[in-house]
């Protein structure tokens, strides 16, 4: 197989502003306890790499993306979350080996979600959807 | 086969606008970012830059940040280089290249379009 | 911006002859990935570059495997072993480690 087909993934990824996405790219036999990566950036020497496998079928998270990758069945899945229009961009789903690695691009683009009711309100009180957020990040802290 | 077409020679006046083009054939336009590169007369190269043809996202080296513009024209596999307000100094030919896959140099060139600038 | 130096500007060659040409960089370029990002051109007058080498060492498909790379950090060497009448032309050593990416000023190969 050429240097190419060793690893795919889809080659267009659609998320919703605020909602999460997730990308599965599929690996050939033989590279199941190489390190796994996405990064981030259309050119490949200088894209930066987000989050990467630890070489185990662990989840690794870092900020709003997460990488885990199942042996078994050859495939590793990010997941990205919190979705900002920022986000949309050239991604590589990546192997990490010795001389080059192997990678393959996927476009991510990011829809703007849908205005709601209470959003369009002229009301510059916080609504309960609002503070359901920010209970979340108080939660978190 | 992979092909880069350049539009033809343009002779302009110093203070006008020129828009370059740059036809890609025989591959996905939207999967290779494409480079633009300057040769004055008798001169070397310069690397200018170049756009993310997915998203069409420009990035210019500091010596053609201002009244250079790349843009696409994605529908036509093209993508464009314009210059406003023209000096001397840009007459050169211009150059679009593209990358390998694993950004191992550039493959593939364009035939070069000659800009001359006169009053 | 990294200052790429070619030496010589002019070298003139019988064919047949092994032609060398140098090209210096002002600082390292050895990428953040480990990976060195030197390459060389050749263009033949009228005509649009060609890739000869990439990664240093690493001859483009098609290349005769007379073109050889070679170096590291900051000095680099392209050689032709044996230089035939297609070689004529002007050679561009070029950085891609470092955002401006940077071309030598060239070297022209000509018929002693």
């Known amino acids: 197989y050429s240097i190419v087909t060793q690893i795919t993934g889809p080659t267009t990824v659609n998320g919703l502003e605020r909602g999460s996405l997730t990308v599965q790219c599929v690996y050939r036999s033989g590279w199941e306890t190489y390190l796994k990566w996405w990064c981030r950036g259309a050119i490949w020497r200088d894209c930066k790499i987000l989050v990467k496998t630890s070489g185990s079928e662990q989840e690794v998270k870092r900020d709003r993306v997460s990488i885990k990758d199942n042996q078994k069945n050859r495939t590793f899945t990010v997941t990205m979350e919190d979705l900002m229009k920022t986000d949309a961009d050239t991604y590589w789903c990546g192997i990490e080996k010795t001389g080059n690695d192997l990678g393959v691009t996927v476009q991510v683009t990011i829809d703007p979600a849908p205005v709601t009711q209470e959003e369009t309100s002229s009301s510059p009180t916080l609504t309960g959807h609002h503070l359901d957020n920010r209970h979340k990040l108080l939660k978190l802290s | 086969q992979i092909q880069l077409v350049q539009s033809g020679p343009e002779l302009e006046k110093p203070g006008e606008t020129v828009k370059i083009s740059c036809k890609a054939s025989?591959?996905?336009?939207?999967?290779?970012?494409m480079h633009w590169v300057k040769q004055a007369p008798g001169k070397g190269l310069k690397w200018m830059g170049w756009?993310?043809?997915?998203?069409?996202?420009?990035t210019y080296a500091d010596d053609f940040k201002g009244r250079f513009a790349f843009s696409l024209e994605t529908s036509a596999s093209t993508a464009y280089l314009q210059i406003n307000n023209l000096k001397n100094e840009d007459m050169a030919t211009y150059f679009c290249?593209?990358?390998?896959?694993?950004?191992?140099?550039?493959?593939?060139w364009g035939q070069g379009t000659t800009l001359t600038v006169s009053s | 911006d990294v200052l790429m130096t070619q030496t010589p500007l002019s070298l003139p060659v019988s064919l047949g002859d092994q032609a060398s040409i140098s090209c210096r960089s002002s600082?390292?370029?050895?990428?953040?990935?480990?990976?060195?990002?030197l390459e060389w051109y050749l263009q033949k007058p009228g005509q649009s570059p060609k890739l000869l080498i990439y990664?240093?060492?690493n001859r483009f498909s098609g290349v005769p495997d007379r073109f050889s790379g070679s170096g590291s950090g900051t000095d680099f060497t392209l050689k032709i072993s044996r230089v035939e009448a297609e070689d004529l032309g002007v050679y561009y050593c070029?950085?891609?480690?470092?955002?401006?990416?940077?071309f030598g000023g060239g070297t022209k190969l000509e018929i002693k």
């Open positions: 290249a593209r990358m390998d896959y694993y950004s191992n140099g550039f493959n593939y």
């Open positions: 025989g591959y996905t336009f939207t999967n290779y970012p």
């Open positions: 756009i993310n043809t997915y998203s069409g996202v420009p």
């Open positions: 600082q390292s370029i050895v990428h953040s990935n480990g990976n060195t990002y």
């Open positions: 990664k240093v060492s």
């Open positions: 070029f950085q891609g480690s470092h955002v401006p990416w940077t």
